[in-house]
Interface confidence: low
């Protein structure tokens, strides 16, 4: 009954699989995986790669089944798919599997890189783009400048990177970036190494972020536009719910909200 035998795609179309509150969470968070079928189903199965039997199943006579993962651990991270079936399909017949959902359970996201495009040396009047590149899509990226406590720019990106444009005349300086999940419960990356942007004729240098004087460590997105980003140590307690960052510089902030979860 639980060995998935997948018929042609047109026969039993695939369901949609989503995660609440997010696909990237810190350990200890309760995660709900929602499997939504395009037609009423009776049994839903949650599968992991290499397993022929469902990790979990739910008997629900509707289009939606919820799988509850309580206080997730990093070991529960990984790739999930869901399928649905009706008993009249015959033994072991499941729908086409959903697209993969990758659940990442981590205390901290990998450190991003920060590079200058076309390069860290700026000619008079020329603009420069700073690319903060992480490894995950649909993240919110934050750019800091040494000596400025509040984030300089903020971008949500569907790509695993975000580009920040600096006007040439104001570009020289020391920069750092980090990224975080776009909604609570927030998971933050380590901060990138600093990047020095200089005028032509002055040599750039890279320094470890920790040695950049006057630059705040990235904080959780403050709810108050005037709030300063606190240091990392002030927001690491597990389970703390953080508030979204509001834009500091309206002209450089991308106000498009993250894609909404169709399962909500």
């Amino acid at each position: 009954d639980i060995t998935p035998s997948v018929p042609p795609a047109s026969y039993h179309p695939k369901p949609w699989l989503g995660a609440q509150p997010a696909t990237v969470v810190t350990p200890g968070v309760n995660v709900t995986l929602r499997c939504r079928a395009p037609q009423p189903a009776w049994r839903f199965g949650l599968f992991k790669p290499g397993e022929i039997a469902p990790l979990l199943f739910r008997d629900v006579s509707s289009e939606l089944a919820e799988f509850f993962l309580e206080e997730v651990t990093p070991a529960q991270g990984g790739i999930y798919r869901c399928c649905y079936r009706r008993p009249d399909w015959g033994p072991g017949v499941w729908s086409q599997p959903s697209d993969v959902l990758e659940l990442l359970v981590t205390e901290e996201l990998p450190r991003p890189s920060l590079v200058a495009l076309p390069g860290p040396v700026v000619g008079p009047g020329a603009n420069v783009s700073l690319r903060c590149a992480g490894r995950l899509r649909n993240m919110s990226f934050v750019l800091y400048r040494e000596g400025v406590a509040a984030p300089l720019q903020y971008r949500h990106s569907a790509q695993p990177w975000a580009d920040f444009t600096l006007l040439g005349a104001r570009a020289p300086g020391t920069y750092s970036c980090y990224y975080h999940t776009p909604s609570a419960p927030y998971v933050l990356s380590q901060r990138s190494e600093v990047l020095v942007i200089s005028w032509e004729g002055e040599g750039p240098e890279a320094r470890p972020a920790s040695s950049a004087p006057g630059m705040q460590a990235p904080g959780p997105p403050p709810s108050d536009p005037g709030a300063q980003a606190p240091s990392l140590s002030s927001f690491r307690p597990r389970g703390l719910v953080l508030q979204p960052l509001l834009p500091q510089t309206q002209d450089s902030w991308d106000p498009a909200p993250p894609p909404s979860d169709p399962g909500v």
Partner: antibody
């Protein structure tokens, strides 16, 4: 052998409340959708409530919605039906059933509810 | 709500006679299920998914139909087949039963 044993029926005044229980054995209770079905004195069968295997989802017809609550205790292999604001038309034999797909495949012996003043 | 209408309400048949009872549905469904209830006992699943016989059901019983029209047939009536037969749809909420066909021995 699958066995479903209902209990808790009796005589109740209109507006009163009663809780029915169904003890299940012979199968993995926590893996099955369960339902209550009643049979009126005129021998009509009426679906009353359904609950998903984990208890997260419940379904009712309009005739009992807001008055009846189906629940389950998977640790005790027991299904419940809490009935309140009872009416004379709720008088029936109440059967606990196991869902075997799109239909109840096993039924208990039933317990009788009489609503009368 | 999907209303199931059974006909006839009561019928009688002689031993060996072919018996057919029908169940019509107010809106199309994928599968019909049938229950048998003998006097003073609980209903029993008899035919499921339109045409599949439940465990222990004699081969003289068959089910057929699609859309809004379904039927249960006994190829050769026997005394033990005396009972009330109910059709049931589990395809959509609210789940509904027919009023039953009472089969008697002539």
């Amino acid at each position: 052998d699958v066995k479903l044993v209902e209990s808790g029926g009796g005589l109740v005044k209109p507006g009163g409340s009663l809780k029915l229980s169904c003890a299940a054995s012979g199968f993995t209770f926590s893996s099955y959708v369960m339902s209550w079905v009643r049979q009126t004195p005129e021998k009509r069968l009426e679906w009353v409530a359904t609950i998903s295997s984990g208890g997260s989802y419940t379904y009712y017809p309009d005739s009992v919605k807001g008055r009846f609550t189906i629940s389950r205790d998977n640790a005790k292999n027991t299904l419940y039906l809490q009935m309140s604001s009872l009416k004379s038309e709720d008088t029936a034999m109440y059967y606990c059933t196991r869902e075997g797909g799109n239909s109840p495949d096993y039924w208990g012996q039933g317990t009788t509810l009489t609503v009368s003043s | 709500e999907n209303v199931l209408t059974q006909s006839p309400a009561i019928m009688s048949a002689s031993p060996g006679e072919k018996v057919t009872m029908t169940c019509s549905v107010s809106s199309s469904i994928s599968y019909m299920h049938w229950y048998r209830q003998k006097s003073f006992t609980s209903p029993q699943l008899w035919i499921y998914d339109t045409s599949k016989l439940a465990s222990g059901v004699p081969g003289r019983f068959s089910g057929s139909g699609s859309g809004i029209s379904y039927s249960l047939t006994i190829s050769s009536m026997e005394a033990e087949d005396v009972a009330t037969y109910y059709c049931f749809q589990g395809s959509e909420y609210p789940l509904t039963f027919g009023a039953g066909t009472k089969l008697e021995l002539k």
